[in-house]
Amino acid sequence: QRKRRNTIHEFKKSAKTTLIKIDPALKIKTKKVNTADQCANRCTRNKGLPFTCKAFVFDKARKQCLWFPFNSMSSGVKKEFGHEFDLYENKDYIRNCIIGKGRSYKGTVSITKSGIKCQPWSSMIPHEHSFLPSSYRGKDLQENYCRNPRGEEGGPWCFTSNPEVRYEVCDIPQCSEVECMTCNGESYRGLMDHTESGKICQRWDHQTPHRHKFLPERYPDKGFDDNYCRNPDGQPRPWCYTLDPHTRWEYCAIKTCADNTMNDTDVPLETTECIQGQGEGYRGTVNTIWNGIPCQRWDSQYPHEHDMTPENFKCKDLRENYCRNPDGSESPWCFTTDPNIRVGYCSQIPNCDMSHGQDCYRGNGKNYMGNLSQTRSGLTCSMWDKNMEDLHRHIFWEPDASKLNENYCRNPDDDAHGPWCYTGNPLIPWDYCPISRCEGDTTPTIVNLDHPVISCAKTKQLRVVNGIPTRTNIGWMVSLRYRNKHICGGSLIKESWVLTARQCFPSRDLKDYEAWLGIHDVHGRGDEKCKQVLNVSQLVYGPEGSDLVLMKLARPAVLDDFVSTIDLPNYGCTIPEKTSCSVYGWGYTGLINYDGLLRVAHLYIMGNEKCSQHHRGKVTLNESEICAGAEKIGSGPCEGDYGGPLVCEQHKMRMVLGVIVPGRGCAIPNRPGIFVRVAYYAKWIHKIILTYKVPQS
């Protein structure tokens, strides 16, 4: 059985409108129906109607059709508002242009190309002919209107009223000529309703044959009227879903208007130094993505092929390789010159309306309600409501949604280090905001530092790979190399993550670094079988003032007899005084004939107060520091050891309790070493590991 064609696409809809006939001679036909589609089918086929149907009204309340032999342009008729009514007018009768050869043209032009008045179709004067309205039913040979009943090449024509000229074509423009757009047609609100290959467009308020998200009620500002071509999503030009089940969508052939200007309402506010809204109007010259990778030129197809060209997006200022937002993305972006990274956001461009108030927070900032919305590295914060799923993934209670408004910096997870936000940048999912604690605020974020309230060790035993302890159990030691030389130590805390010190990264170019694992000799001599050399893919800087860095490896380390991870302590834990610990490193030894082998120095934990006394009161330790003194005078960490761990054992479990950072001198006799207290930053470490993506092995 042949599927009945859905003809409602041939009608122009005017919601909440009906037609009232002033002329009583005009006929109307009514009938109860279920849908407007049924009305449309009957109107198109003129089935059971005593007139040529040009329009209909669907009464939604009474489920009734009113068919008319007239439309809103006819004389003796007026439009009227009515909540329950929708007016549908056959587009062929209101269109003043032709599609293709104009076979369906039913407009009212009645003058030929050279200006001669047309002869009525029902008349044989001055020219006899066989084109009688009765012979060409459905071709609307009414009055003396130009028509093309046989679909001939020249388009609509008529017999002329001049006896010397039998017939002539009428000068009716192609719809694709009449219709024009500015830029890429995002503001186009014309009546083009077919694609460049001639397919009829699907109505936006229909979901057949193609289901889609562009519902007129959901996007009232996008002009989703009837089945007209539109550009709601920043494509190069207007398009539509088609009635062909095998062609989901196609572009429409709409030319660019000669006077290519935009209405003031269409122009986003242009800025050059900062981003307003989503940055559609950004016209500055930043030409790298957030991490410094340069942008590809918009007019280039290398290394990435794309259709975001200056020709396709005429008003989007796709000059050079500047960051732009031509397609309504979250913020300005570009294709990158790195063949492995197609696109990236230029989220380092500041927000114009960013608050620069001298904000501060108390305690850990969980009650901070300021309106800063930028991270410490200058990335614009992303809206909280877009990130609730991620937030739920790392907190186990319901966050206070009333505090999480817009994209302001907040602390919904009770982070010890202050307000933060999500960034919308896949490589830096979240970061802290540049807000300090209020002056004079002494609220501790961890209490009872020198009293062993929380044990540092988790309950599990020391892990031994395959039942054999790793060589002297230092498989977690990492040698960080800077331009092929050892520069610092580090601790492998997860297959893809090394904990080390901020000062170990003199250069911002990650290509300058490598991580060596599984070695005992700093030059890797004799370690060939067990050595793993890994590139560095990212540095995640610790909270302000922490001196910590989590270094992400380009691929995960393979854990084996020579490479293992070391455990982290519980957050906020304290380790008893006099606990024996060790520092490891390949650094300066004081020996002239240094053999390059990993060294260990044994230290014991000292309380912060006592430690301060040993430093003659010149140093006040805070909750983020831990102190350990040497058993042997003059032994302790030095240059080359920085970034390495202070390792302690509790309940037969070894953990990295401290990180060696510069600033306290080299193994000075009677001066205990001061380390970064890892327990204070344990939550931050876990949060990074949980939220940052790592490459799969």
């Epitope: 331009r483 010190a501 000062q503 240059e639 600033g663």
Partner: antibody, heavy 114, light 110 residues
Framework: VEESGGRLVTPGTPLTLTCTVS????????MSWVRQAPEKGLEWIAV?????ATDYASWAKGRFTISRTSTTVDLRIPSPTTEDTATYFC?????????????WGPGTLVTVSS | AYDMTQTPASVEVAVGGTVTIKCQAS??????LAWYQQKPGQPPKLLIY???KLASGVPSRFKGSGSGTEFTLTISGVECADAATYYC????????????FGGGTEVVVK
Amino acid sequence: VEESGGRLVTPGTPLTLTCTVSGFSLSAYAMSWVRQAPEKGLEWIAVIYVIGATDYASWAKGRFTISRTSTTVDLRIPSPTTEDTATYFCARVYDSVWNHFNLWGPGTLVTVSS
Amino acid sequence: AYDMTQTPASVEVAVGGTVTIKCQASQSISSWLAWYQQKPGQPPKLLIYQASKLASGVPSRFKGSGSGTEFTLTISGVECADAATYYCQQAYSVSNVDNAFGGGTEVVVK
């Protein structure tokens, strides 16, 4: 930040310039040497980072050595040539790693001439 | 290498006018660029860091912009005191660098 040690030397005579710092600790800031030949532009020579690592301009490797104590940063020129005639500035880097310079000494003049 | 090219070498500007100095990096340095002003017989003075941030005590007529490889220092409403030589410096990496500084631009105020 104050430089010293600049003087007139003959080519090949080793020379050490010293930069003495006060009011801040070398355990918190990287330090650098920059020079400027008469009527010429600034030329970066070397940097010593907080962790003790060093970097040199590609032309300066082997011609200069940067080192430090707890309060001084030295630049050794083992075998100066006439092209090394310049005012030498010591500059504090605004960080423990490579960055911009936010504190400069007045400079010390080195003249290499036979 | 991350080497810097500065243009022009010299520029003349009238009091109250605007001067623009360009600096180009041989590779992307993100926003890690600083600008200095140097007057004869004096050490350089920091004006701008991280491409666009004004150093403390520097008048707001000095403006830095750009990122990646192209950077600009703009001095608007030029005053006599602005006659000096201006240098850019990359603060990204000194890996195989010939000079971290640009060649300098002399600004002559008429």
